[in-house]
């Protein structure tokens, strides 16, 4: 069964800066990745970035530097200040559309006890949804 993992890390140098990494553990080819915050897309979440292997990348503030890390994982930096800044309990979700598996989504947030600069290892997040 395919899985999606989400890792959220707060940067030690900037406490309002977060790095989100997501990956797809499956054999299919990825056709689209959507990153959102505040919950899943379509369920009260806000699209932060969309990444397509051929058509490129779009991102919306406070997202910066969305990029492919590998063919099956992506990363994204959030630089926030004021109202647009993410907080420690913000939920981030990644949805991977792949062929032939379909769409798989997982969400994660900063581990509650983590210090800046530290993060939990990238494990499959508890919220998992297949369309």
């Amino acid at each position: 069964t395919p899985e999606v993992w989400v890792q959220v890390r707060m940067e030690a140098t900037e406490l309002s800066s977060f790095t989100i990494r997501c990956g797809f553990l499956g054999s299919g080819s990825i056709s689209l990745v959507t990153v959102s915050w505040g919950g899943p897309n379509g369920a009260g979440g806000t699209t932060l970035a969309v990444l397509h292997p051929e058509r490129g990348i779009r991102q919306w503030a406070p997202a910066r530097q969305a990029r492919w890390e590998t063919q099956s994982s992506i990363s994204l930096i959030l630089e926030g200040s004021g109202a647009s800044s993410p907080c420690a309990n913000t939920t981030f979700c990644c949805k991977f559309a792949s062929f032939p598996e379909g769409s798989w989504e997982a969400c994660g947030s900063l581990p509650p006890s983590s210090d800046p600069g530290l993060s939990a290892p990238p494990t499959p997040a508890p919220i998992l949804r297949a369309d």
Partner: antibody, heavy 119, light 106 residues
Framework: QVQLQQSGPELVKPGASVKISCRSS????????INWVKQRPGQGLEWIGW????????YYNEKFKGKATLTVDKSSTTAYMLLSSLTSEDSAVYFC????????????WGQGTTLTVSS | DIQMTQSPSSLSASLGGKVTITCKAS??????IAWYQQKPGKGPRLLIH???TLQPGIPSRFSGSGSGRNSSFSISNLEPEDIATYYC????????FGGGTKLEIK
């Protein structure tokens, strides 16, 4: 087909407020950012801000913070822009525009709403 | 904030000819530039995004290129319906429009 239909022209007095609407059809309203753009007579285009209808998340151009307030009504797939404390500098045509994501920014536009501020 | 300097502000060209408009950003915009056509009394129309990607239904007479801070937009084989004002837009970091270029036919 995708359409954005804006409300009609407005003539208002200085100091008053006005609410402009932009009704979307032909796509999933909650999946795409709606942007607002100002164009003064004979001038260029200025980005005011955006709202993501799926979550009500807003982001404003610093210049328009306190001047514009963006909201949506999901049930009617309509975006609104409230402009307050109006002066003659606010007289302009205001456009709403959908951000198409990978299809391109501002890929569909409303027809524009003309606002005239005059006593 | 990223500033966009668009030039020229106006130009005149002959039917069948070619024109080129340039936009210079105050910093690298990673190819995130779009070009719009606006006719009097109408909303703008997206022609090109991501520097050179033509929107569906837009004739191949329109083209875009560039990298880093510099971008250009060209129309070849000018036709009467190309009379309009053209704007660039950077969307790498929020949104900033260029000042516009008014195209007239000689």
């Amino acid at each position: 087909q995708v359409q954005l239909q804006q409300s009609g022209p407005e003539l208002v007095k200085p100091g008053a407020s006005v609410k402009i609407s932009c009704r979307s059809s032909g796509y999933t309203f909650t999946d795409y950012y709606i942007n607002w753009v100002k164009q003064r007579p004979g001038q260029g285009l200025e980005w005011i801000g955006w709202i993501f209808p799926g979550s009500d998340y807003t982001y404003y151009n610093e210049k328009f913070k306190g001047k514009a307030t963006l909201t949506v009504d999901k049930s009617s797939t309509t975006a609104y822009m409230l402009l307050s404390s109006l002066t003659s500098e606010d007289s302009a045509v205001y456009f709403c525009a959908r951000d198409g994501g990978l299809r391109g920014p501002f890929d569909y536009w409303g027809q524009g709403t003309t606002l005239t501020v005059s006593s | 904030d990223i500033q966009m300097t668009q030039s020229p502000s106006s130009l005149s060209a002959s039917l069948g000819g070619k024109v080129t408009i340039t936009c210079k950003a105050s910093q690298d915009i990673n190819k995130y530039i779009a070009w719009y056509q606006q006719k009097p009394g109408k909303g703008p129309r997206l022609l090109i995004h991501y520097t050179s990607t033509l929107q569906p239904g837009i004739p191949s007479r329109f083209s875009g290129s560039g990298s880093g801070r510099n971008s250009s937009f060209s129309i070849s084989n000018l036709e009467p319906e190309d009379i309009a004002t053209y704007y660039c837009l950077q969307y790498d970091n929020l949104h900033t429009f260029g000042g516009g270029t008014k195209l007239e036919i000689k």
